[in-house]
Structure formats: C-alpha cells, structure tokens
C-alpha cells in the first residue's frame, strides 16, 4: 500500500519521518504514533489503526514521547539518602529532588541517588563556588587578599577585612586569611607588646 501522510504508514527501511513522535513497529512493518508525555499506550497500532494513548493515572508519569504500555511510578525524595523535594511529580515529570543543604551528591545514576555531608573548609579558606549546588564535594580555596574566614565550616564565606578608617578608628593589628583586622581608637595607647613598632 502507498505511504500515507499520517501514521500508521508503511516503512520499508525501518525508519520513520518523525523520530521523536513516531516509532517503527516491526510486526506490521509500519510507523505508528508515540504517545505524548503524560500518557501511555492503551492500544497498540495495527496496519489500519494508529496507537491509542491514555493519560497516566495519579502518582505515575511518562516524561517523553513514548510507546510504553505503562506509566512510571512516582517516587518520593528519600530523606535517608539526604534528598529533598524541589518540585512534585506530575503526569509528565518525575519528582524533582536535590541534596539537602550542607550536602553534596555522592552517587549519580542518571540522577542523584545518595547525598553526603559537605567537607568543612578550614579557617583561611572557603568552598569554591560551583555552577550547581550539591553537585560535588567542597573544594576549599584560600581566601583572596584582603579577606578572611575564621571557622571550620562547609559553607562559611571569606569576608573582607574591616577597614578601620571607615569607622573612625585606626588599625591595631592587620587582618590575616584567618582573622579580621583589629581596630582601635586613635587616642588609645598602643598595647605594651606593640610599643616601639610603627603601624603601617
């Protein structure tokens, strides 16, 4: 029979015009319609009938154009594995999960399956910012010049050293990567250990 404009149509080379929305059915040697996201195959096609689709039942989904005879069961985000929900399951999309705050994805199989606590960054360092939160463990980098971080923490950020002059004070001790600048009132005497040294 002659190829038709719409499925089902005969295909001698086992390929279909629209790979996303059609599939090759080898038993009948035809191209048939796939079912749209949120639906499944209720009745398979034949030479004279196209696929019949039905809506996924509650708590199930199919994400793509498909020729599945069932919908996938929605699964909750497992808090024991360190996951939390960011978007609920719909007929067209599975539950969207991410690692809980302070955790990173330690096991990945198409999606994150297990999260672990982020490593602490020691004083004088901070976690390097990543494109996607929870994607990997912390990579600690030194605070850049003029900044400090004085705790062991997975999330603390390096802060700029205090500028004493902005507060009408003078510097008593310079800041380091692990501590802030120490300021003092300009009228106060130098501490004993600093007498005789010139503060720059």
């Amino acid at each position: 029979s002659q190829p038709q404009a719409v499925p089902p149509y005969a295909s001698e080379n086992q390929t279909c015009r629209d790979q996303e929305k059609e599939y090759y059915e080898p038993q009948h040697r035809i191209c048939c319609s796939r079912c749209p996201p949120g639906t499944y195959v209720s009745a398979k096609c034949s030479r004279i009938r196209d696929t019949v689709c039905a809506t996924c039942a509650e708590n199930s989904y199919n994400e793509h154009w498909n020729y599945l005879t069932i919908c996938q069961l929605c699964r909750p985000c497992d808090p024991v594995m360190g996951l939390e929900e960011i978007a609920p399951c719909t007929s067209k999309r599975k539950t969207q999960c991410r690692c809980q705050p302070g955790m990173f994805c330690a096991a990945w199989a198409l999606e994150c399956t297990h999260c672990e606590l982020l490593s602490d960054c020691p004083p004088g360092t901070e976690a390097e910012l990543k494109d996607e939160v929870g994607k990997g463990n912390n990579h600690c980098v030194p605070c850049k010049a003029g900044h400090f971080q004085n705790t062991s923490s997975p999330s603390a950020r390096c802060q700029p050293h205090t500028r004493c002059e902005n507060q009408g004070l003078v510097e008593a001790a310079p800041g380091t990567a692990q501590s802030d600048t120490t300021c003092k009132n300009p009228l106060e005497p130098l501490p004993p250990e600093m007498s005789g040294t010139m503060l720059m």
Epitope: H28, A43, K44, S46, R47, I48, R49, V52, A54
Partner: antibody
Framework: QVQLQESGPGVVKPSETLSLTCTVS????????WTWIRQPPGKGLEWIGY???????NYNPSLKSRVTFSVDTSKNQFSLKLNSVTAADTAVYYC??????????????WGQGTMVTVSS | EIVLTQSPGTLSLSPGERATLSCRAS???????LAWYQQKPGQAPRLLIY???SRATGIPDRFSGSGSGTDFTLTISRLEPEDFAVYFC?????????FGQGTRLEIK
Amino acid sequence: QVQLQESGPGVVKPSETLSLTCTVSGGSISSYFWTWIRQPPGKGLEWIGYIYYSGSTNYNPSLKSRVTFSVDTSKNQFSLKLNSVTAADTAVYYCARVETIMAFDAFDIWGQGTMVTVSS
Amino acid sequence: EIVLTQSPGTLSLSPGERATLSCRASQSVGSSYLAWYQQKPGQAPRLLIYGASSRATGIPDRFSGSGSGTDFTLTISRLEPEDFAVYFCQQYDTSPITFGQGTRLEIK
C-alpha cells in the same frame, strides 16, 4: 461466552438520524476495539468503523462525514449514529468485536444483526 | 481502497467434494491481514480464517486458507451439508477495511 445484541428502530425516515446500540454481555467492553458493519439486502458487507472502549474512533472515509460512534462502559454498550439517511442506508447492521491480538483486526464475535429500513 | 474480487460468484458442488474459492486483491495485501467468513441465510457472518491461513477457534480442519500478495484461496477439503453458505474474504491491511462480494456455495 461473549455475546453481542444490536437494538434500535427498524424504520427511519429519509434525512433523519439512524441510531443503534450494541450491548455486550458475558464479558467486558474494556480493552477491546468494537466495530459496526452493514449489509444491504442481497449485497456484500461494508465496514463502517471502529470504536475503542476509551472512545477513540476510526471511520470508513466514505461515511465519516455522517457517522458518530460512542461508548458507555458503565452499561457495556457502544452506539452508532448515522445522520441524513437515504434509501441507500437500508441494510442489516451488525456490531462485532475486533480481534487484535492473534488476528490483528479480524472480527471474531458478531451480533445477529438488525434490519434498518429507510422509508417515509 | 483495496477491491477484493471473489470467484466464482456461485459454486455448485455435492457433499464430500472439494471446494476451492478464490479472492483476488486489486493491490498487494500482507498475508497476515486477510480473513475468510462464512454466512448462512439470516445469520451473521462467522470468522473462519485469519492471517490468510490460521483457523479461528472451533473451526474444523477441513477448512484451510492459503495465498499471498494479491491471490488468496479458501479450500474446504470435503464438503459437509452445513458448509453450503456464502463465503466472504476481507482485507485489513489498508484502511478502509474491505470485503469481497462473496461466493455462494450451493448444493449441486
């Protein structure tokens, strides 16, 4: 044992609508395609179309503009409406089950048929 | 649409004889998509053969089907009195589904 029974008026006036119902007993209407076929007196068989239990339909292009199928799963029934009838629509109307697993689309169980005459 | 032409129009045979009924299609029909039906007066058709050669449930083995492409045959190896009826072929390879005009098998 699945059985089919057609029902509806035996006479319809020209230009009016022919309405028939097929009742399925001894089994569920669900998960099957169902079909209507007609046979004018002393002539051959003409396929009218399919309906799936979910309501999906396929019609013979020659009748598509005049025909409507519907299904009522709660009553285990499916129905045919053919509008603007003429004398050429006089026929025995059969409902049947479509065998889609082994025979793909052959009709394995038939009703006994109901004669419909179009006459004023 | 595919036109199915059955021959002969009428076949006159005696019980015990062999009947050969022909169905020719206007274009090629996949052998999985051809069926044969038997119809007795005042009754609905009954499915005999589907897929050109597979017997439907409860059909005696004296009925057999064969053929491919455009030529198909229904054979009744040894006619019984209850076999005298009208026989239709049907294709469901291409929409719309079509039937042959029928072969009347009558007692000689």
